[in-house]
Protein backbone atom coordinates (compact mmCIF):
# COMPACT_ATOMS: atom_id res chain seq x y z
CA UNK A 1 0.00 0.00 0.00
CA UNK A 2 1.10 3.53 -0.46
CA UNK A 3 -0.02 7.17 0.65
CA UNK A 4 0.06 9.96 -1.14
CA UNK A 5 0.12 13.56 0.37
CA UNK A 6 -1.24 16.53 -1.78
CA UNK A 7 -0.10 20.44 -1.03
CA UNK A 8 -4.18 20.03 0.04
CA UNK A 9 -3.63 17.74 2.67
CA UNK A 10 -5.65 15.27 1.17
CA UNK A 11 -4.21 11.46 1.63
CA UNK A 12 -5.01 9.41 -1.43
CA UNK A 13 -4.40 5.40 -0.53
CA UNK A 14 -3.76 3.25 -3.21
CA UNK A 15 -3.88 -0.98 -2.87
CA UNK A 16 -3.09 -3.25 -5.09
CA UNK A 17 -5.30 -5.63 -6.18
CA UNK A 18 -5.26 -9.23 -7.17
CA UNK A 19 -7.59 -11.15 -9.04
CA UNK A 20 -7.71 -14.53 -10.82
CA UNK A 21 -8.59 -14.99 -14.47
CA UNK A 22 -9.40 -18.35 -14.04
CA UNK A 23 -12.37 -16.52 -11.80
CA UNK A 24 -13.76 -15.03 -14.98
CA UNK A 25 -13.08 -17.28 -17.56
CA UNK A 26 -10.79 -20.34 -18.88
CA UNK A 27 -7.81 -18.15 -18.75
CA UNK A 28 -4.97 -18.61 -16.63
CA UNK A 29 -2.58 -16.54 -14.19
CA UNK A 30 -3.25 -13.33 -12.40
CA UNK A 31 -4.85 -10.10 -13.02
CA UNK A 32 -3.64 -6.96 -11.32
CA UNK A 33 -5.69 -4.18 -10.27
CA UNK A 34 -5.13 -0.62 -8.79
CA UNK A 35 -7.80 0.44 -6.38
CA UNK A 36 -7.88 4.54 -5.18
CA UNK A 37 -9.58 5.61 -3.06
CA UNK A 38 -12.23 2.70 -2.63
CA UNK A 39 -12.38 2.77 -6.60
CA UNK A 40 -11.04 0.30 -8.75
CA UNK A 41 -9.44 1.91 -11.36
CA UNK A 42 -6.68 -0.69 -13.47
CA UNK B 1 -17.82 -22.22 4.30
CA UNK B 2 -14.69 -24.36 4.82
CA UNK B 3 -13.00 -25.77 8.52
CA UNK B 4 -9.26 -25.16 8.22
CA UNK B 5 -6.35 -26.74 10.50
CA UNK B 6 -3.10 -25.64 9.40
CA UNK B 7 0.02 -27.73 10.28
CA UNK B 8 3.96 -28.46 9.80
CA UNK B 9 5.57 -25.43 11.43
CA UNK B 10 8.31 -25.71 13.99
CA UNK B 11 11.76 -24.27 14.39
CA UNK B 12 14.22 -24.07 11.76
CA UNK B 13 17.43 -22.80 10.93
CA UNK B 14 18.28 -20.02 8.28
CA UNK B 15 18.51 -21.90 5.14
CA UNK B 16 16.47 -24.98 5.92
CA UNK B 17 13.29 -25.96 4.67
CA UNK B 18 9.38 -26.52 6.02
CA UNK B 19 6.82 -27.96 4.19
CA UNK B 20 3.00 -26.41 5.56
CA UNK B 21 -0.01 -28.20 5.33
CA UNK B 22 -3.84 -27.47 5.32
CA UNK B 23 -6.43 -30.24 5.69
CA UNK B 24 -10.21 -28.87 4.75
CA UNK B 25 -13.31 -30.40 5.84
CA UNK B 26 -16.43 -29.92 3.71
CA UNK B 27 -17.07 -31.35 0.28
CA UNK B 28 -16.99 -27.70 -1.25
CA UNK B 29 -12.94 -27.57 -1.08
CA UNK B 30 -12.67 -27.36 -4.65
CA UNK B 31 -14.80 -24.18 -5.17
CA UNK B 32 -12.35 -22.37 -3.29
CA UNK B 33 -9.72 -20.23 -4.11
CA UNK B 34 -7.34 -21.18 -1.25
CA UNK B 35 -4.49 -18.76 0.24
CA UNK B 36 -1.22 -18.55 2.83
CA UNK B 37 -1.09 -15.52 4.53
CA UNK B 38 1.14 -14.91 7.81
CA UNK B 39 1.68 -12.29 10.84
CA UNK B 40 4.65 -11.34 12.60
CA UNK B 41 4.18 -10.11 16.21
CA UNK B 42 3.34 -6.65 15.95
CA UNK B 43 2.67 -6.33 12.63
CA UNK B 44 -0.78 -6.83 10.17
CA UNK B 45 -1.47 -10.82 8.88
CA UNK B 46 0.20 -10.11 5.10
CA UNK B 47 -0.31 -11.89 2.38
CA UNK B 48 2.15 -14.61 1.20
CA UNK B 49 0.84 -16.71 -1.58
CA UNK B 50 -2.54 -18.01 -3.00
CA UNK B 51 -3.76 -21.04 -5.69
CA UNK B 52 -6.95 -21.45 -7.92
CA UNK B 53 -9.52 -23.57 -7.41
CA UNK B 54 -8.37 -26.07 -9.76
CA UNK B 55 -4.65 -25.35 -8.96
CA UNK B 56 -3.98 -23.92 -12.41
CA UNK B 57 -2.43 -20.75 -11.44
CA UNK B 58 -0.52 -19.47 -8.30
CA UNK B 59 0.38 -15.45 -7.15
CA UNK B 60 3.21 -14.99 -4.72
CA UNK B 61 4.33 -12.20 -2.62
CA UNK B 62 7.51 -10.65 -3.69
CA UNK B 63 9.45 -11.35 -0.71
CA UNK B 64 8.35 -15.35 -0.61
CA UNK B 65 8.73 -15.40 -4.76
CA UNK B 66 11.19 -18.38 -5.89
CA UNK B 67 11.91 -19.90 -1.89
CA UNK B 68 8.17 -20.59 -1.55
CA UNK B 69 6.09 -22.92 -3.75
CA UNK B 70 1.98 -23.03 -3.24
CA UNK B 71 0.28 -26.41 -3.93
CA UNK B 72 -2.99 -28.02 -3.45
CA UNK B 73 -5.01 -31.58 -3.91
CA UNK B 74 -8.40 -31.27 -4.43
CA UNK B 75 -8.55 -35.21 -3.65
CA UNK B 76 -7.10 -34.58 -0.51
CA UNK B 77 -8.90 -31.61 0.39
CA UNK B 78 -5.21 -29.94 1.23
CA UNK B 79 -2.87 -27.21 0.20
CA UNK B 80 0.61 -27.25 1.03
CA UNK B 81 3.33 -24.87 1.29
CA UNK B 82 6.89 -25.76 0.90
CA UNK B 83 9.25 -22.87 1.86
CA UNK B 84 12.78 -23.61 1.16
CA UNK B 85 15.88 -21.05 1.60
CA UNK B 86 14.17 -19.85 5.13
CA UNK B 87 14.71 -16.19 6.51
CA UNK B 88 15.00 -15.20 10.16
CA UNK B 89 12.29 -12.26 8.24
CA UNK B 90 9.85 -15.34 7.58
CA UNK B 91 9.40 -16.13 11.55
CA UNK B 92 5.35 -15.46 11.77
CA UNK B 93 2.76 -17.00 12.19
CA UNK B 94 1.03 -18.88 9.04
CA UNK B 95 -2.49 -18.93 8.31
CA UNK B 96 -4.18 -21.14 5.62
CA UNK B 97 -7.30 -19.30 3.98
CA UNK B 98 -10.55 -19.61 1.60
CA UNK B 99 -11.53 -17.04 -0.30
CA UNK B 100 -14.96 -16.50 -2.90
CA UNK B 101 -14.92 -17.08 -6.49
CA UNK B 102 -13.88 -13.78 -7.84
CA UNK B 103 -12.14 -12.31 -4.16
CA UNK B 104 -9.13 -10.32 -4.29
CA UNK B 105 -6.78 -13.39 -3.71
CA UNK B 106 -4.21 -10.88 -2.04
CA UNK B 107 -6.06 -9.37 1.00
CA UNK B 108 -6.98 -10.70 4.18
CA UNK B 109 -10.75 -9.51 4.36
CA UNK B 110 -11.38 -11.09 1.14
CA UNK B 111 -11.36 -14.16 2.94
CA UNK B 112 -14.19 -16.49 4.30
CA UNK B 113 -12.56 -18.84 6.10
CA UNK B 114 -9.37 -19.38 8.12
CA UNK B 115 -7.64 -21.93 9.90
CA UNK B 116 -5.97 -20.88 12.97
CA UNK B 117 -2.65 -20.82 12.50
CA UNK B 118 0.83 -22.74 12.50
CA UNK B 119 4.14 -20.85 14.10
CA UNK B 120 7.16 -20.76 12.12
CA UNK B 121 10.42 -19.66 13.29
CA UNK B 122 13.49 -19.35 12.01
CA UNK B 123 16.48 -18.86 14.10
CA UNK B 124 19.78 -19.88 14.55
Known amino acids: DAEFRHDSGYEVHHQKLVFFAEDVGSNKGAIIGLMVGGVVIA | EVQLVESGGGLVQPGGSLRLSCAAS????????MGWFRQAPGKEREFVATITRSGGSTYYADSVKGRFTISRDNAKNAVYMQMNSLKPEDTAVYYC?????????????????WGQGTQVTVSS
Open chain 2, 97 to 113: AAARIGAAVNIPSEYDS
Open chain 2, 26 to 33: GRTFSIYN
